[in-house]
Interface confidence: low
């Protein structure tokens, strides 16, 4: 066989060229739809393995959606019919606890996880004889070897990372099954940025196939934790990026989750959204929030897909999604996964295995009810062609979905067999649905969560509460001591109380200056590459949070390091959660905190509050009887009517829903 082109194997230190044979009766040239089940014989390292594959019917829901944009920037929605897709999962005959994620679209491409090794397989470029290359995943990053770096040097470099006699995968899986008996389903939404789309030759089909392949790989990694990955949607920024991707990873992550909350959630329900970018951030290939998978505002991550294979990229996405699922880094903890490095190791690349720590972290998330959105099954367990009525998800064309016939016996509003409302019912679910009827307009459905939030009410003609809005960023709160920011009054005392308990309060300014001028993990103004940044005096109040009067020590799933610094007659308390540089640090002062007269913290700098773009003159716009909300509309006090609070009424805004009911004004809270 001809040697593959340099491009295909330049990232490999060792590989074999093989010709798999198909064991089923159908010829390889069989037309689509692809077989539901197929078996192959493949060779690896002198051994023949029989692999059994089954189409991954859980990978894509029937209503899988792809969003793109035309040249004018108009959103285009496509529901591609890809139920008979070519993405499979399976196992190696006779190999206990093996797993496989392969696509059989144009030859075999994917991952084989055996008990002691993982292999990659892909079609040999320009081969007309169904030849493939197969390689150990461990051999992917040994390119330095051909550049004059000896094996001994590599061994010395990596020896200290290797664990002595890790437990076998069988033991680990047995332990995990006991820990996580109930299957969880992550409804994943992927967004691909313009540069990555361009890099793929602006070929939407190629991007879509690659992202489905990625989801199949993720599913094969997460299945060991009894977590299934379901790709519910894909958005490709074909016409330009819809967020600013200039700046650090933290800035881009913040921009992405804000965009997600504002534009994506309303379009397609999902549990976590992951942005795929071509642009790199130096040493950081991804960033995500920890334990936020079911959060409206923070269930997202960003992932750099540059000059690497999709197989390697899968471990990056698995890592960042793992953070969303409550998993912290394995570093410095007693973790094992039966491999040299595990997916949640901070520096691991190409790892396929989750550690015992990751399983425990995820279990903590579920015990703390942080994973409730993962319980619904996105689609039925039957084949793709099966109707989706009965999956407890209201799909296109359904009015309700109460689940199995047994569950539907308990539902007074929904006809289980048809997923339609019963004849007398107006609704079957939702915050504004009670006893199969819409709640009256003016019924409170989402209360005020802070002095910077506003309530929402049912509108009387929908089962859903009005979309969540809050007071416009930059509005003064805490008696002018702070500003509203994303629905919260951001001030130091409150942040100290979240971390150190109800008696804690902000330390004096001297504490912030003294500690944050050091530029170490306990006192800094952010992290740049491999070093902490020292805070200039003017930015010290925007670095690590410093508290006093501490009487409680925090534990948030991971035990943080706590430092106590004596300063001018008080003790300054700070905390380092050691989450790593791809995770926003909850021990830093929150964005939007007032750090001086007319100033707020942003990106660890004390900057002019004008960056919040607060432009509401409440006297003029709301006639002194209301405040502006996050949509820049007046939210009026009780006694005044929207939109401008100049006539008598019952308060609220054009966004909040009616705050009263003409039949019963006592409904107002």
């Amino acid at each position: 066989a001809a040697r593959p082109g340099f491009q295909q194997t330049s990232h490999l230190s060792s590989y074999e060229i093989i010709t798999p044979w198909r064991l089923t009766r159908e010829r390889r040239e069989a037309p689509r739809p692809y077989s539901k089940q197929v078996s192959y014989v493949i060779q690896a390292e002198g051994k023949e393995h029989i692999i059994h594959l089954e189409r991954n019917k859980d990978l894509l829901p029937e209503d899988f959606v792809v969003y793109t944009y035309n040249k004018e920037g108009t959103l285009i929605t496509d529901h591609p019919n890809i139920q008979n897709h070519c993405h499979y999962r399976g196992y190696v005959e006779g190999v206990h606890n093996s797993s496989i994620a392969l696509s059989d679209c144009f030859g075999l491409r994917g991952l084989l996880h055996l008990e002691n090794a993982s292999y990659g397989i892909e079609p040999l470029q320009n081969s007309s004889h169904f030849e493939h290359i197969i390689y150990r995943m461990d051999d992917v990053y040994k390119e330095p070897l051909k550049c004059g770096v000896s094996n001994k040097d590599i061994e010395k470099e990596t020896a200290k990372d290797e664990e002595e006699e890790p437990p076998s995968m069988t033991q680990l899986l047995r332990r995990r099954r006991a820990v996580l008996p109930q299957t969880r389903y992550v409804e994943l939404f992927i967004v691909v940025d313009k540069e990555r789309y361009d890099m793929m030759g602006r070929n939407q089909t190629a991007v879509r196939e690659e992202m489905i392949l990625l989801a199949n790989y993720l599913d094969s990694m997460y299945i060991m934790l009894n977590i299934r990955i379901v790709l519910v949607g894909l958005e490709i920024w074909t016409n330009g990026n819809l967020i600013n991707i200039v700046g650090g990873a933290g800035d881009v992550l913040g921009n992405f989750v804000q965009w997600r909350e504002k534009f994506l959630i309303t379009r397609r329900r999902h549990d976590s959204a992951q942005l795929v970018l071509k642009k790199g951030f130096g040493g950081t290939a991804g960033m995500a929030f920890v334990g936020t998978v079911c959060s409206r505002s923070h269930a997202g991550g960003i992932n750099v897909f540059g000059q690497i294979t999709v197989e390697t990229f899968a471990s990056i996405v698995a890592h960042e999604l793992g953070h969303n699922l409550g998993m912290n880094h394995d570093d410095g903890r007693d973790c094992s996964c039966g491999a040299k490095s595990c997916i949640m190791n901070s520096g691991a690349s190409g790892s396929r295995n989750f550690s015992s720590c990751s399983a425990e972290d995820f279990e903590k998330l579920t015990l703390n009810k942080g994973g409730n959105c993962l319980l619904n099954i996105p689609k039925p367990d039957e084949a793709y062609s099966a109707p989706s009525c009965g999956n407890k998800l209201v799909d296109a064309g359904e009015e309700c979905d109460c689940g199995t016939p047994k569950e539907c016996e308990l539902d007074p509003c929904c006809e289980g067999s048809t997923c339609k409302l019963k004849s007398f019912a107006e609704c079957a679910y939702g915050d504004c649905c009670k006893d199969c009827r819409f709640l009256p307009g003016g019924t409170l459905c989402r209360g005020k969560t802070s002095e910077c939030d506003v309530p929402e009410y049912c509108n009387g003609s929908s089962q859903f509460c009005q979309p969540d809005v809050f007071i416009q960023n930059g509005y003064p709160c805490q008696n002018n001591k702070a500003y509203c920011y994303n629905g919260m009054c951001q001030y130091y005392d409150a942040q100290c109380q979240v971390i150190f308990g109800s008696k804690a309060k902000a330390a004096p300014k001297d504490c912030f200056i003294e500690v944050n001028s050091k530029g170490d993990r306990f006192g800094n103004c952010g992290f740049s590459g491999n070093e902490y940044k020292k805070c200039a005096t003017g930015n010290a109040l925007c670095g690590k949070l410093q508290c006093e009067n501490v009487q409680e020590i925090p534990v948030f799933g991971i035990v943080p390091a706590i430092i106590q610094t004596p300063s001018r007659g008080t003790k300054c308390w700070g905390v380092d959660f050691q989450l790593g540089s791809d995770v926003p640090d909850p021990g830093m002062v929150n964005e939007g905190t007032k750090c001086g007269a007319g100033k707020i913290c942003r990106n660890f700098q004390c900057v002019d509050a004008s960056v919040l773009n607060y432009d509401c003159d409440v006297q003029k716009k709301c006639h002194g009887h209301g405040v502006c909300n996050s949509n820049k509309n007046c939210h009026c006090e009780n006694g005044w009517a929207p939109p401008n609070c100049e006539t008598k009424g019952y308060g609220g805004s054009v966004d909040s829903g009616p705050t009263y009911n003409e039949m019963n004004t006592a409904l107002r809270d």
């Epitope: 330095p144 470099e157 990596t158 130096g282 040493g283 290939a285 890592h319 540089s581």
Partner: nanobody, 127 residues
């Protein structure tokens, strides 16, 4: 494939200065970081410094902080290592390395994370 060529090495007295260059060619758009390592006779290879291609972020090993400065010229695809106040213990072969894989949290000091290497240039500091 990225190619790296070092130059500028030589013999210098203690307290003197040298400027090393590392010219990159090939698909340099894929480079994330470029670093310098050194290897003295009979010793293990040792990390010296790194610079991030995109934004110029730098990181130095403690033993060279304040004496060595790494910089880059994007237009010329070249990285420089300015070495001042050289000491006899700085004697070694200095090798340039490039990282093209955007690892999540790269350990700059680990040679394993660099995928292209130059041939090296000898620096000898006499006392």
């Amino acid at each position: 494939e990225v190619q790296l060529v070092e130059s500028g090495g030589g013999l210098v007295q203690a307290g003197g200065s040298l400027r090393l260059s590392c010219a990159a060619s090939g698909p340099t758009f894929s480079i994330y970081d470029m670093g310098w390592f050194r290897q003295a006779p009979g010793k293990e290879r040792e990390f010296v410094t790194v610079i991030r291609w995109s934004d110029g972020f730098t990181y130095y090993e403690d033993s060279v902080k304040g004496r060595f400065t790494i910089s880059r010229d994007n237009a010329k695809n070249t990285v420089y290592l300015q070495m001042n106040n050289l000491k006899p213990e700085d004697t070694a072969v200095y090798v340039c390395a490039a990282n093209t894989a955007p690892l999540r949290i790269i350990n700059f000091r680990n040679a394993y994370n660099y995928d292209y290497w130059g041939q090296g240039t000898q620096v000898t500091v006499s006392s």
